[in-house]
């Protein structure tokens, strides 16, 4: 699987999950989150050659098409597969509230 | 929705479904399919700016990150959303067989 275990410990050139830290204030302009100040969101990057973690029958066909037509702009793209939630603390006035923001962290990628 | 109805009738620059015809023999090297000789597979293409058909909470965050950090390589990607099957005819010896190949045609796209 193209997950953090594999991707973070390798020098994989093809589609893989990459490290990305997002600072809520600086990178998103969000002032309302109190904790954490930012988080490891990660992102997906890398080419999707034929047979590389292809998601559907269509992505297999497209990768094969791309192999036969190397100059074509039609190609599968490396996108998130498994996403995880992020617990945050925000304030309503002076009162802290805990919330789970769903689908915030990329754990693995796929070619779609 | 970024579907064929909208995308094929517009000059949309952002993520949208585009026309692509795949010839089974020429483009895939598949000789086993008897009918059709090829099909309109379509593909997804175009940038994913902020608020453009974003798929998950993560893709919203990533697009917003990208807006604040325009030079970053982390950005959502335009990928298939709705896929449809393709009925095909192939031969087993001299006997024709009809099969549905699932997830073969792109009907709409999303930013993931």
């Amino acid at each position: 699987a193209l997950d953090t275990n594999y991707c973070f410990s390798s020098t994989e050139k093809n589609c893989c999950v990459r490290q990305l830290y997002i600072d809520f204030r600086k990178d998103l302009g969000w002032k309302w989150i109190h904790e954490p100040k930012g988080y490891h969101a990660n992102f997906c990057l890398g080419p999707c050659p034929y047979i590389w973690s292809l998601d559907t029958q269509y992505s297999k066909v497209l990768a094969l098409y791309n192999q036969h037509n190397p100059g074509a702009s039609a190609a599968p793209c490396c996108v998130p597969q498994a996403l995880e939630p992020l617990p945050i603390v925000y304030y309503v006035g002076r009162k802290p509230k805990v919330e789970q923001l769903s689908n915030m962290i990329v754990r693995s990628c796929k070619c779609s | 929705a970024l579907d064929t109805n909208y995308c094929f009738s517009s000059t949309e620059k952002n993520c949208c479904v585009r026309q692509l015809y795949i010839d089974f023999r020429k483009d895939l090297g598949w000789k086993w399919i008897h009918e059709p000789k090829g099909y309109h597979a379509n593909f997804c293409l175009g940038p994913c700016p902020y608020i453009w058909s974003l798929d998950t909470q993560y893709s919203k965050v990533l697009a917003l990150y990208n807006q604040h950090n325009p030079g970053a390589s982390a950005a959502p990607c335009c990928v298939p959303q709705a896929l449809e099957p393709l009925p095909i005819v192939y031969y087993v010896g001299r006997k024709p067989k009809v099969e549905q190949l699932s997830n073969m045609i792109v009907r709409s796209c999303k930013c993931s």
Epitope: W30, W32, Y90, V92, E99 | K60, L64
Partner: antibody, heavy 120, light 108 residues
Framework: EVQLVESGGDLVKPGGSLRLSCVAS????????ISWVRQAPGQGLEWMGG????????NYAQRFKGRVTLTADTSTNTVYMELSNLRTEDTAVYYC?????????????WGQGTLVTVSS | EIVMTQSPASLSLSQEEKVTITCRAS???????LAWYQQKPGQAPKLLIY???SRAPGVPSRFSGSGSGTDFSFTISSLEPEDVAVYYC?????????FGQGTKLEIK
């Protein structure tokens, strides 16, 4: 230029419901918090609730809980306020406003307001 | 909920006079959870002061705010004709946000 434009105000019968819209432009909608405040004719200001558009987290004034629902659509930069079981005392101008960034905060930009009249 | 009591309810002063409006909270707001607004007839409120004493961008320097805890004040150092309006204080320390009942300012 920062702009908030409310719409959907109407004459409604008691017991009815209404959906008001607030369309934002000129700023990064999803980095902000939007509040709704109403003002009955000749009266003061009353905060109803606020929503964080990108995550759809809403906070309401206790007296409106169960009767008001705030939602957001980041694809159209719109916040919606649904108000149900309307009473004559809900007659007011309804404003949406951008906060300075926190859920409860000062509000630096306001819409022009939309008038809701509840009468039989 | 926190009750905000504004005084006076109305005020009539001459041009260039100093204006002071006070706002008392039913419980302590700390030092920074208070704002002041100006509302002219037929218009939406306009933010003047936030954090008890910070002027909003573009607000003239004749407007100022001070205070902490339960007692806050708003001052216009020299009254101008365009300052005729209703002024509101607002607390945002606790939910729900609450406003004072307003002070109507007129020119003699």
């Amino acid at each position: 230029e920062v702009q908030l434009v409310e719409s959907g105000g109407d004459l409604v019968k008691p017991g009815g419901s209404l959906r008001l819209s607030c369309v934002a432009s000129g700023f990064t909608f999803s980095s902000n918090v939007i509040s709704w405040v109403r003002q009955a004719p000749g009266q003061g200001l009353e905060w109803m609730g606020g929503v964080i558009p990108i995550v759809d987290i809403a906070n309401y004034a206790q007296r409106f809980k169960g009767r008001v629902t705030l939602t957001a659509d980041t694809s159209t930069n719109t916040v919606y306020m649904e108000l149900s079981n309307l009473r004559t005392e809900d007659t007011a101008v309804y404003y949406c406003a951008r906060t300075l960034g926190l859920v409860l905060d000062a509000m630096d930009y306001w819409g022009q307001g939309t008038l809701v009249t509840v009468s039989s | 909920e926190i009750v905000m009591t504004q005084s006076p309810a109305s005020l009539s002063l001459s041009q260039e006079e100093k204006v002071t409006i006070t706002c008392r909270a039913s419980q302590s707001l700390g030092s920074s959870y208070l704002a002041w607004y100006q509302q002219k007839p037929g218009q939406a409120p306009k933010l003047l002061i936030y954090g008890a004493s910070s002027r909003a961008p573009g607000v003239p320097s004749r407007f100022s705010g001070s205070g902490s805890g339960t007692d806050f004040s708003f001052t216009i150092s020299s009254l101008e004709p365009e300052d005729v309006a209703v002024y509101y204080c607002q607390q945002y320390a606790d939910s729900p946000i609450t406003f004072g009942q307003g002070t109507k300012l007129e020119i003699k």
